[in-house]
């Protein structure tokens, strides 16, 4: 089936340059996942984005061009959640300690961890450099953004019977057409200024009745804080 060349993320839009200052690109010679800067030296990403060597790229907009605002920092520690399950993608979360502190400025800044779980209907911002085509491929150079609502856990579980754990939630549109996609993994879902989700999985991208599934960051705040404290 043909696809719309104007589709972004899938069905999103070009983010305004450096308007998502907490968004990072994980690079291993090429962009493979996203992530979120949560303090000067730590990034949250997805467990299934694990690689033994990662360069974290901050301040990026066009990942194919050096635009002058980038900070490239190697990972010093890569800590996947101890209960990560690669088959079910339960506990799909990972922490990356940077080898040096990021310089915080207007184009590189942190995002807050959640103080409450995501509420159904809340509008969130999803971003990443993943595939923008729901069928086939069209990888963007510039960061893509998508505004999407948190779906109820009931609708989420109905979309993926037996696959949704309490550590997952759905964001998106049951009618399809708008979603995160391959290459967006690990990236942020920010609702009301808090990092509520990490791009995790889905059945295809932007398919009807198959919304994106995200790691529920709220469930991991204690683990994140304890891990950072133990590795500082």
């Amino acid at each position: 089936a043909p696809f719309d060349d104007d589709d972004k993320i899938v069905g999103g839009y070009n983010c305004e340059e450096n308007s998502v200052p907490y968004q990072v690109s994980l690079n291993s010679g090429y962009h493979f996942c996203g992530g979120s800067l949560i303090n000067e030296q730590w990034v949250v990403s997805a467990g299934h984005c694990y690689k033994s060597r990662i360069q974290v790229r901050l301040g990026e907009h066009n990942i194919e061009v050096l635009e002058g605002n980038e900070q490239f920092i190697n990972a010093a520690k890569i800590i996947r959640h101890p209960q990560y399950d690669r088959k079910t993608l339960n506990n799909d979360i990972m922490l990356i300690k940077l080898s040096s502190r990021a310089v915080i400025n207007a184009r590189v800044s942190t995002i807050s961890l959640p103080t409450a779980p995501p509420a159904t209907g809340t509008k969130c911002l999803i971003s990443g450099w993943g595939n923008t085509a729901s069928s086939g491929a069209d990888y963007p150079d510039e960061l893509q953004c998508l505004d999407a609502p948190v779906l109820s856990q009931a609708k989420c579980e109905a979309s993926y019977p037996g696959k949704i754990t309490s550590n997952m939630f759905c964001v998106g549109f049951l009618e399809g057409g708008k979603d995160s996609c391959q290459g967006d993994s690990g990236g942020p879902v920010v609702c009301n200024g808090q990092l509520q989700g990490v791009v995790s999985w889905g059945d295809g991208c932007a398919q009807k009745n198959k919304p994106g599934v995200y790691t529920k960051v709220y469930n991991y705040v204690k683990w994140i804080k304890n891990t950072i404290a133990a590795n500082s």
């Epitope: 595939n131 069209d138 993994s185």
Partner: antibody, heavy 127, light 108 residues
Framework: QVQLVQSGAEVKKPGASVKVSCKAS????????MHWVRQAPGQGLEWMGS????????NYAQKFQGRVTMTRDTSISTAYMELSRLRSDDTAVYYC????????????????????WGQGTMVTVSS | EIVMTQSPATLSVSPGERATLSCRAS??????LAWYQQKPGQAPRLLIY???TRATGIPARFSGSGSGTEFTLTISSLQSEDFAVYYC??????????FGGGTKVEIK
Amino acid sequence: QVQLVQSGAEVKKPGASVKVSCKASGYTFTGYYMHWVRQAPGQGLEWMGSINPSSGGTNYAQKFQGRVTMTRDTSISTAYMELSRLRSDDTAVYYCARVGGAAAAGKAYTASAFDIWGQGTMVTVSS
Amino acid sequence: EIVMTQSPATLSVSPGERATLSCRASQSVGSNLAWYQQKPGQAPRLLIYGASTRATGIPARFSGSGSGTEFTLTISSLQSEDFAVYYCQQFHNWPPLTFGGGTKVEIK
């Protein structure tokens, strides 16, 4: 081991149709996209289209739209490519090829390539 | 449609010598590029994916480099079994998936 085995050579008359099969073994058929590529005698490789064996969703090259149909039978792990209204310039070897890197649920980027190819099916169109 | 252009069309090299094959994309394909080897009467075989990662079982004498629009396949020391046709292919933006026209590596 992982392999794709295609049906045998075909000789067809102009205007006829041909259906080539590609049987997968050694892996989970529904977990990997299948593509079809052809090669005319002495020529390069030409992409025809793809099928997602899990959903049945297809993508066809514009050149073949309306003439090609890609289907699959998951019960026997087999993909099919049917080309109709054959012309003499459709004479070629037709290959099925699997895209490596499982069509996993996770949304990390994985580099794509055709890691497993069928042995090819020669289709000759001649009056 | 992204057009892939390979050069040269034919490369004459002596066994043991280095061969450098070029592939150019009409627009950026990032690192979404693969290289294949094809011998007469055989299906293509994957050599390199992600522009620079060797496929399973491919000898270290084959290496890929480049990103964006310019890519290179290097065979450091040609063996007799390396004389074949080599194709590049982009997976960055499809449909359609596109291949280069091929480079034939022949014995000098």
